[in-house]
C-alpha cells in the first residue's frame, strides 16, 4: 500500500532534478576557471542535505550553509546587476555585458535557476508530485529559503554602484514583496554601496513617460535613502537593442566599450 503523501499547492520537484543540478555544476565549473576547484558531487550532496528528510515547511537558512560554503564565489562587487520581475532581459543583458553579473550568473544561482525542489519529513525521497507554495502553504519552503539565502549574500557582497533592472510595464514597478524589495534592498551594505541605480525598462515603442516618477520608485528611493545609500533612476527605452545582442553576442554593438 503506497504511503500517504502530503499534497502541496505548488508544482513538484523538477523532473531529473539531481541530474540537472549535477550537470549544471559540471558545465559551470568547466566554463568558469575560477570555480574549477569545486567538487560537483560534494555540491550536490550539500544541496540534497539541505532539504532531504526535512519537513518542507521547516527549512532554515542554516540548512543551506554547507552548500553556501562550497559555492563561495567572488564576483566583482562593483559589477552587480539586481533585477525584479524582468529576469529574462537582465540575463540577456549580462550575457552581452560580460563584466556585469546577476545572481544567476554565479554558481549557486545558475544551479537553481527555474528549478523547484522539496523533500519529505523522515524519508530520503524527493517529492516530484507537489511542493509548498510560498503563499498558499508556507514561506519556509526549500526553494524560497534558498533564494532568500543566496539573494541576501549576493546583496551583502555588492559595493560602489549597484544596478537594478525593473520592469516598467508592471503596475508595481518596485514591489516591496519581491525578492529584490524584501531581501536585497535591505541587505545592501551602506558602508560599501555608494549608489543604487535603477534602470526602469520601458516596453512600448512610443512610451515616453518618466517612469522614474512612479510612486513605487519614490518608495524605493525613500527606503534606500533612509539606509544612507544614494539613489539614482534612469528611464531605459528600446529594449529590443538587448534582444539583438542575444542573437549576436559577439557583435561589436553588444558591448558598452565605445
Amino acid at each position: 500500500v503506497p504511503r500517504w503523501r502530503q499534497q502541496w499547492s505548488g508544482p513538484g520537484t523538477t523532473k531529473r532534478f539531481p541530474e540537472t543540478v549535477l550537470a549544471r555544476c559540471v558545465k559551470y565549473t568547466e566554463i568558469h576557471p575560477e570555480m574549477r576547484h569545486v567538487d560537483c558531487q560534494s555540491v550536490w550532496d550539500a544541496f540534497k542535505g539541505a532539504f532531504i528528510s526535512k519537513h518542507p515547511c521547516n527549512i532554515t537558512e542554516e540548512d543551506y550553509q554547507p552548500l553556501m560554503k562550497l559555492g563561495t564565489q567572488t564576483v566583482p562587487c562593483n559589477k552587480i546587476l539586481l533585477w525584479s520581475r524582468i529576469k529574462d532581459l537582465a540575463h540577456q543583458f549580462t550575457q552581452v555585458q560580460r563584466d556585469m553579473f546577476t545572481l544567476e550568473d554565479t554558481l549557486l544561482g545558475y544551479l537553481a535557476d527555474d528549478l523547484t525542489w522539496c523533500g519529505e519529513f523522515n524519508t530520503s525521497k524527493i517529492n516530484y508530485q507537489s511542493c509548498p507554495d510560498w503563499r498558499k502553504d508556507c514561506s519556509n519552503n526549500p526553494v524560497s529559503v534558498f533564494w532568500k539565502t543566496v539573494s541576501r549574500r549576493f546583496a551583502e557582497a555588492a559595493c560602489d554602484v549597484v544596478h537594478v533592472m525593473l520592469n516598467g510595464s508592471r503596475s508595481k514597478i518596485f514591489d516591496k514583496n519581491s525578492t529584490f524589495g524584501s531581501v536585497e534592498v535591505h541587505n545592501l551594505q551602506p558602508e560599501k554601496v555608494q549608489t543604487l541605480e535603477a534602470w526602469v525598462i520601458h516596453g512600448g515603442r512610443e512610451d515616453s513617460r518618466d517612469l522614474c516618477q512612479d510612486p513605487t520608485i519614490k518608495e524605493l528611493e525613500s527606503i534606500i535613502s533612509k539606509r544612507n545609500i544614494q539613489f539614482s533612476c534612469k528611464n531605459i527605452y528600446r529594449p529590443d537593442k538587448f534582444l539583438q545582442c542575444v542573437k549576436n553576442p559577439e557583435d561589436s554593438s553588444c558591448t558598452s566599450e565605445i
Partner: antibody, heavy 120, light 107 residues
C-alpha cells in the same frame, strides 16, 4: 574602422524631393539603430529620424513627420532618407549617425554630412 | 517633451577648468550625452551615459548629472578644446533632443 558616408544632397526647389543615402562600413550594420541628424547653417543640431535594426520601427521629429521617410537595406549596409515636400527650413547639413549599444541612446559615430539646400 | 537649455557661450583661460551646464526637467532620470563640434566638422561624442568617456577621449573630459542639470567639465582646458558643445538626451518614442549648444572660447 567605422565609416559613414552620406550622399544625395544638393539644391532643390521648395516642394521638391530628394533622397539621401548613407553607406556604412567597419561594423555590423544590421545590429544598430541608425539616425539622421541635421544642422541648419549657423544653428544647432536637430535630430530628424531613427530606424531600428531591422527597419520595423521608425521614429520622426514632429518637424518632418509625414514628409520624410527613413529606411534601410541591411544587405547593402545603407541607410536612406526620402525627403518630400521640402521647405526652406529643411536647408541643412544632414548627418547619418550610428546609435550607441544597450541602455544608451546617443550617437557613437557620425558621417561628414551632406548639404541640402532648399531654395527657389 | 523635455527642453535642454545650455549657456550660449563659456570662456576659460588655458589650463583652467571649464564647466558647461545643460538643464531640463528631471534630467537626472535620463542619460545625457555630450558632443564636441569644431567648425566645418561633424560632431564627436565626448561623454555618454552621463559620465562615461569613449575610448580616445582625453581624461580631462568628465560629466555628471543630478537634479535638473547635467554638467560637462573640462579640466586643464587646452586651446584645441575650443569648439561648440552640445548636450543630448532621449526621453522615449520620438523625443530625442539636443541642447542649443555652447561655444567654448579658450582665452
Amino acid at each position: 574602422q567605422v565609416q559613414l558616408v552620406e550622399s544625395g544632397g544638393g539644391l532643390v526647389q521648395p516642394g521638391g524631393s530628394l533622397r539621401l543615402s548613407c553607406a556604412a562600413s567597419g561594423f555590423t550594420f544590421s545590429s544598430y539603430y541608425m539616425n539622421w541628424v541635421r544642422q541648419a547653417p549657423g544653428k544647432g543640431l536637430e535630430w530628424v529620424s531613427a530606424i531600428s535594426m531591422h527597419g520595423d520601427t521608425t521614429y520622426y521629429a514632429d518637424s518632418v513627420k509625414g514628409r520624410f521617410t527613413i529606411s534601410r537595406d541591411n544587405s547593402k549596409n545603407t541607410l536612406y532618407l526620402q525627403m518630400n515636400s521640402l521647405r526652406a527650413e529643411d536647408t541643412a547639413v544632414y548627418y547619418c549617425a550610428r546609435d550607441l549599444p544597450l541602455v544608451y541612446t546617443g550617437f557613437a559615430y557620425w558621417g561628414q554630412g551632406t548639404l541640402v539646400t532648399v531654395s527657389s | 517633451d523635455i527642453e535642454l537649455t545650455q549657456p550660449p557661450s563659456v570662456s576659460v583661460a588655458p589650463g583652467q577648468t571649464a564647466r558647461i551646464s545643460c538643464s531640463g526637467d528631471n534630467l537626472r532620470h535620463y542619460y545625457v550625452y555630450w558632443y564636441q563640434q569644431k567648425p566645418g566638422q561633424a560632431p564627436v561624442l565626448v561623454i555618454y551615459g552621463d559620465s562615461k568617456r569613449p575610448s580616445g577621449i582625453p581624461e580631462r573630459f568628465s560629466g555628471s548629472n543630478s537634479g535638473n542639470t547635467a554638467t560637462l567639465t573640462i579640466s586643464g582646458t587646452q586651446a584645441e578644446d575650443e569648439a561648440d558643445y552640445y548636450c543630448q538626451t532621449y526621453t522615449g518614442g520620438a523625443s530625442l533632443v539636443f541642447g542649443g549648444g555652447t561655444k567654448l572660447t579658450v582665452l
